[in-house]
Interface confidence: low
């Protein structure tokens, strides 16, 4: 029985050319996290495997940094980065948990700073 829940940063906005943190957290389960996948729509951005460590997809390696935690930092944002991002937690014995984040990249003069994710 899957009892866990995924908390995410939800819907966020950021300025073109800036950086943003995508963060998910799995709670309410004692299941062991074996791997976390980060995907943008149908593209794999990065994997963090409990045994093998991080792998960043080659097409994103210049703009994606691991962390904080099991999250991702996206840099040099463009309007094309707007869209859905998914954190996929592979766990044992529960199975797979998925969280969704929607990122909107705005022109600098329009971005709402208050909507940007702040690390507590």
């Amino acid at each position: 029985m899957m009892t866990g829940t995924i908390e995410t940063t939800g819907n966020i906005s950021a300025e073109k050319g800036g950086s943003i943190i995508l963060q998910c957290h799995l709670s309410s389960t004692t299941a062991q996290v074996t791997q976390v996948n980060w995907e943008q729509q149908d593209q794999l951005l990065a994997i963090c495997n409990a045994d093998l460590g991080w792998h960043i997809s080659p097409s994103f390696k210049d703009r994606v940094a691991p962390g904080p935690g099991l999250g991702l930092t996206l840099q040099s944002l463009t309007v094309n980065d707007t869209g859905e991002y998914f954190c996929i937690y592979h766990t044992y014995p529960d199975g797979t948990y998925t969280g969704r984040i929607f990122l909107e990249v705005l022109e600098s003069s329009v971005a709402e700073h208050g909507a940007r994710f702040q690390i507590p």
Epitope: C48, G53, L70
Partner: nanobody
Amino acid sequence: EVQLVESGGGLVQPGGSLRLSCAASGNTFSGGFMGWFRQAPGKEREWVASVLRGGYTWYADSVKGRFTISADNSKNTAYLQMNSLKPEDTAVYYCTTDSLPGWGQGTLVTVSS
């Protein structure tokens, strides 16, 4: 729970250098990531640099060529060598690992003449 202890901050003149250390203890996720963030007064916390177990490194554009991140995996310790410091580098510096929540108490770096 992971415990993170940062050290090495202080007051330095523009153009000077500092080396920050971050020691991690407790249950760490074995991906081997450690990173540094900073928060200047009145600003959001921002990412500075990251290092993986395999030695891969990433830097924010604002510190590229001036800061060097490294890690000693046997000691679960990350370092941030900061050279050619500028007044705008003044901030509380925090380290993180790939365990959650994973934030230390921070160490203050002040760059001023």
